[in-house]
């Protein structure tokens, strides 16, 4: 009642290995690492057979089949390439995930290399079975920002792609008679979020209540250069409008807000996010130079009073930009305290501009980002938001522009963007 001698399968083994197998003896067939037992189209780790009374084995020896991890999953904003010839997906084959450069970058700077494991899963040394994440690259325009800027008063035309984070925010309140329409700027933080000033998105009421405009009345344009030609721009409606809860209409303290876009915008050469600063209380240091862009008033001969009285919303057709130095808090406070009127330069604000005037941001530039190049990270960072200025015409001597100090609000911004009320996919590479 002996059973015939067994031949182990290729890439496999039989245990126990005996010279003779008798009735009721059992053997376990297993495969080498990276191979699985294949029996009747079923895949298993081991297979047991038994020597029967009649001297035959209960089953034929199965074969060992190489583990196949299958086609790798697609990566949002990324692609996968095969490192192994013939696009093999079997055990020990390698693939590499990469992100759509230069607009996306891999989180944690992982290699993106995955190997087909013995368990049949694509595995990375660091991320294990999780896929990498492609985050938008922030603060790195595809076109290098220029070093020298001549005298949005005293500014110059921006070339397309210089400020890929720049957003035009148009608010049209059709519920009012006559229709109320105004605009401001904003800065793209991720595919779904726009950073701006709260006063741009506050419903223009006659009393001092702070109520956000209805999201239905907000349109955001990205990748826009000339407001007369919106054909190349991406326009998006708002899913949510969030004003800072402490925004004070009296003194413009906490003048910061977010717009969540209805759907994520595709990133490209003309649409890229700006970086947020590190959360630190000091903000940008005096004399640091920043750039700010906008479609606001660029005619130095027109006073703000004239514009308000005439009721027109004069704006530049082509995006303008200007380079301005940060002014010390003490100097700015002093310059406003010497004026009639109840001006308050709080610790949530900083100032920028020239003592002699000539260059400034102006009406219509509100909400735009004051960006500074961070030498350490080699990214442009939104340190400020165009907020307010004195009563004199823009660019007047010793009237500095006042900006919201963004570094004081990084915790609030992240909390809002990651709150359960918000859509996911919000991280940005720093």
């Amino acid at each position: 009642n002996e059973c015939p001698k067994l031949q182990p399968p290729v890439y496999g083994k039989i245990e126990p290995s005996q010279a003779v197998y008798s009735f009721k003896d059992q053997v376990l067939v297993s495969c080498d690492t990276g191979y699985k037992v294949l029996k009747d189209n079923g895949v298993m780790d081991t297979f047991q057979i038994e020597c029967l009374k009649d001297g035959a084995w209960s089953n034929k020896i199965p074969t060992c089949k190489i583990v196949d991890c299958g086609a790798p999953a697609g990566l949002k904003h990324g692609l996968v390439t095969f490192s192994t010839r013939n696009n093999l997906t079997t055990y020990k084959s390698e693939i590499r995930y990469s992100c759509q450069q230069p607009y996306y970058k891999m989180l944690h700077n992982t290699t993106g290399v995955y190997t087909c494991s013995a368990h049949g899963t694509w595995t990375n040394e660091v991320l294990k079975r999780s896929l990498p994440t492609c985050l938008p690259v922030c603060g790195q325009p595809s076109r290098a920002l220029p070093n020298l800027v001549k005298r949005i008063i005293g500014g110059r035309n921006a070339e397309l792609g210089l400020f890929p984070w720049q957003a035009l925010i148009v608010v049209e309140d059709t519920s009012r008679v006559p229709n109320d329409k105004w605009f401001g700027s904003g800065a793209l933080l991720s595919e779904s979020w726009i950073l701006t000033a709260a006063h741009v998105l506050r419903s223009q009421r006659r009393d001092n209540t702070v109520i956000p405009v209805s999201k239905e009345h907000v349109t955001v344009y990205l990748g826009l250069h000339d407001v007369r030609d919106k054909s190349g721009a991406v326009n998006s409606s708002a899913a949510r409008v969030i004003l800072h809860p402490d925004f004070n209409i009296q003194n413009y303290n906490h003048d910061i807000a977010l717009v969540q876009l209805q759907k994520p915008v595709p990133l490209g050469a003309h649409v890229m996010p700006i970086c947020l600063p590190r959360p630190e209380p000091e903000g940008p240091a005096p004399h640091m130079l920043g750039l700010v862009a906008g479609w606001g008033i660029s005619n130095p001969n027109v006073t703000v009073d004239e514009i308000i009285l005439s009721g027109t919303r004069t704006l530049s057709d082509v995006l303008q930009y200007v380079k301005l130095p940060v002014v010390s808090h003490a100097e700015c406070k002093a310059s406003y305290e010497s004026r009639s009127g109840n001006y308050s330069v709080t610790e949530n604000m900083f100032c920028a501009g020239y003592y002699e005037g000539g260059k400034d941001t102006c009406l219509g530039d509100s909400g735009g980002a004051f960006v500074i190049f961070d030498e350490m990270s080699q990214h442009w960072v939104a340190q400020g938001l165009v907020s307010w200025g004195g009563p004199e015409e823009c660019g007047s001597k010793q009237v500095y522009g006042v900006y919201t100090k963004v570094s004081n609000y990084v915790d609030w911004l992240w909390e809002e963007m990651n709150s359960p009320r918000a859509v996911r996919d919000l991280q940005v590479e720093r």
Partner: antibody, heavy 120, light 107 residues
Amino acid sequence: QVQLKQSGAELVKPGASVKMSCKASGYTFTTYPIEWMKQNHGKSLEWIGNFHPYNGDSKYNEKFKGKATLTVEKSSSTVYLELSRLPSADSAIYYCARRHYAASPWFAHWGQGTLVTVSS
Amino acid sequence: DIVMTQSQKFMSTSVGDRVNVTCKASQNVGPTVAWYQQKPGQSPKALIYSASYRYSGVPDRFTGSGSGTDFTLTISNVHSEDLAEYFCQQYNSYPFTFGSGTKLEIK
């Protein structure tokens, strides 16, 4: 999670000084200022001042200038409040607290308080 | 300094009632008011910030309203565990100041 652990109760003689501590954990210490409040028995709260570990900047309520001194030991994420020339009116519970948002000084996280008793 | 006045030192209420705790600022503080609850022998706990925003984990029976100088904390359906003292605080300008407190007593 954010935690503020304060030092134990103190019994001090009138005219003496006392130094109490507030040890922070569960967040990046240098991101938020530590605030200090005084609460007399059965009374309301008074804001003494705050200390920002990021740059060592401190702000004081005019009423407590010369009375309170705030210092830091960054290595242990601890802020200290020293009160000098104590009269019996300074017998109170002293709380340290942390803001929820850096720019908005309302206090989401509080220490358990340090009871200071000034008595001869 | 901005004075925060809580005119009612004590308020008596029954379980299930609705109660309004008021606070008045001596000058306009915009929306920058917070409300705290303090139970005997405990540290204060934040309930409301920015006049009307409920802090995380606070039951929705607590609501805040007001702006400028007049502020109200409403407890819509008083529970026995709401027996505590309630303080308002302005954080519009230095020095930050608190109201004198309102003690809620359950009948």
